[in-house]
Interface confidence: medium
């Protein structure tokens, strides 16, 4: 194991500020893998909160492995949190479209789609089943609708998807009770705010599907679900468009939608998920 020869460190009583991880894989233990090469690499050490050197065997391992100290810092420390610069033509894309693919730390093997900012296309990847980030879509179409540019280079302005369980998040069940709204937007807009499992206190916004508004909440810094936006505007862009107000059994108003998929009626109390 790559850590076996490491010098022992000492716990002190000094209280460090809360650790905020950019990506869930930054919490992985350094993994040299089963192969026997001797390759100098860097990993983020959650105990020292620094990027450190380790010897990589050349195969397998995990994502907490970087070619350079700079790359490690860029991915795992908050100093580089604002490293993603969007061009004018990309202003309408939600921030999460620019996140790298992140399979998370679990061991599932689920086909998902992410927007690759290098190729400017949505691509398939294997998701572990937990954590990861919001650049994670159940269908290629959903990914394209939200993150890919239209033919003229501007953001495609149509969201539409079926309601599916994402990341085992709580999803409302269909009900016979008439609802005030019907939803045709991204499925995660229906999930409750989920603080996640880390210990930071970041100001974020989530779409409250009960009241049809974006509301602030405190995000822990990792985990949680996709109903998590860095600004109210981004939240509204992603989720507000999906709701169509129902005024009577026979009529709908406020619709900007051209394409519709399976309608899901929602009538449920607001739920504050309290799971680490």
């Amino acid at each position: 194991d790559s850590e076996e020869d490491e010098e022992h460190t000492i716990i002190t009583d000094t209280e460090l500020p809360p650790l905020k991880l950019m990506h869930s894989f930054c919490a992985f233990k350094a993994d040299d893998g089963p192969c026997k090469a001797i390759m100098k690499r860097f990993f983020f050490n959650i105990f020292t909160r620094q990027c450190e050197e380790f010897i990589y065997g050349g195969c397998e391992g995990n994502q907490n492995r970087f070619e350079s100290l700079e790359e490690c810092k860029k991915m795992c420390t908050r100093d580089n949190a604002n490293r993603i610069i969007k061009t004018t033509l990309q202003q309408e894309k939600p921030d999460f479209c620019f996140l790298e693919e992140d399979p998370g730390i679990c061991r599932g093997y689920i086909t998902r789609y992410f927007y690759n900012n290098q190729t400017k296309q949505c691509e398939r990847f294997k998701y572990g089943g937990c954590l990861g980030n919001m650049n994670n879509f159940e269908t290629l179409e959903e990914c394209k609708n939200i993150c890919e540019d239209g033919p003229n280079g501007f953001q495609v302005d149509n969201y539409g998807t079926q309601l599916n369980a994402v990341n085992n998040s709580l999803t409302p069940q269909s009900t016979k009770v008439p609802s005030l709204f019907e939803f045709h937007g991204p499925s995660w807009c229906l999930t409750p705010a989920d603080r996640g499992l880390c210990r930071a206190n970041e100001n974020r916004f989530y779409y409250n599907s009960v009241i049809g508004k974006c509301r602030p909440f405190k995000y822990s810094g990792c985990g949680g679900n996709e109903n998590n936006f860095t600004s109210k505007q981004e939240c509204l862009r992603a989720c507000k468009k999906g709701f169509i107000q129902r005024i009577s059994k026979g009529g709908l108003i406020k619709t900007k939608r051209k394409r519709k998929k399976q309608r899901v009626k929602i009538a449920y109390e607001e739920i504050f998920v309290k799971n680490m």
């Epitope: 850590e3 209280e15 995990n62 089943g129 996640g196 210990r199 206190n201 822990s220 680490m276």
Partner: antibody, heavy 119, light 107 residues
Framework: QVQLVESGGGLVQPGGSLRLSCAAS????????MNWVRQAPGKGLEWVSA????????SYADSVKGRFTISRDNSKNTLYLQMNSLRAEDTAVYYC????????????WGQGTLVTVSS | DIELTQPPSVSVAPGQTARISCSGD??????VHWYQQKPGQAPVLVIY???KRPSGIPERFSGSNSGNTATLTISGTQAEDEADYYC??????????FGGGTKLTVL
């Protein structure tokens, strides 16, 4: 001196309720996630529940989910465990313990309080 | 989710090296922590982050982790080291998981 002191244990009948408290001192309680760990007589350690520093997120072992509630009052430097619908198998010494930042191990433990569920 | 398996008991002569194992599927990919518990007392952290020693813990305590087994090593075991030892890690949701415990007997 960093210290955790549990209280509230005792004898309770099956189906009954009990509320454990843990008074923290010697450190900035509001900066730390906390958890409860229990140990049945002659048995090993079993994690019960955890709560983040600001109380905004909690987690429970499957064995207590829906019956136990962890909470905290940072103004009083106190951690709580509300235990409802108690069963004989909940009989144990309950330890209050501190998580250091992110590490998910417990670096400070209380002395424990005994909860006995028996008719 | 990860399950941690420890031998129920380990015996060692004074001055010898005691090794307590903790097995779990791909445990090398997780940080493992170790606690010592003496009768009637609360547990004490002896190793964290697989191989890091808290202040106040003697140098004879060390930890390692490879393959599917993490190991707590006590070199030059002393009578006062006789206790129960528990390994601990976390599951996929970062919930705490303990091993079943190992009773270390110093002969």
């Amino acid at each position: 001196q960093v210290q955790l002191v549990e209280s509230g244990g005792g004898l309770v009948q099956p189906g009954g309720s009990l509320r454990l408290s843990c008074a923290a001192s010697g450190f900035t309680f509001s900066s730390y996630a906390m958890n409860w760990v229990r140990q049945a007589p002659g048995k090993g350690l079993e994690w019960v529940s955890a709560i983040l520093s600001d109380g905004s997120s909690t987690s429970y072992a499957d064995s207590v989910k829906g019956r136990f509630t962890i909470s905290r009052d940072n103004s009083k430097n106190t951690l709580y465990l509300q235990m409802n619908s108690l069963r004989a198998e909940d009989t144990a010494v309950y330890y209050c313990a501190r998580y250091p930042d992110w590490g998910w191990y417990t670096d400070v433990w209380g002395q424990g309080t005994l909860v006995t569920v028996s008719s | 989710d990860i399950e941690l398996t420890q031998p129920p008991s380990v015996s060692v002569a004074p001055g010898q090296t005691a090794r307590i194992s903790c097995s779990g599927d791909n445990i090398r990919k997780f940080y493992v922590h170790w606690y010592q518990q003496k009768p009637g007392q609360a547990p004490v952290l002896v190793i964290y982050g697989t191989n890091k020693r808290p202040s106040g813990i003697p140098e004879r305590f060390s930890g390692s982790n490879s393959g599917n087994t993490a190991t707590l090593t006590i070199s030059g075991t002393q009578a006062e080291d006789e206790a129960d030892y528990y390994c601990q890690s976390y599951d996929s949701k970062f919930n705490t998981v303990f091993g079943g415990g190992t009773k270390l007997t110093v002969l």
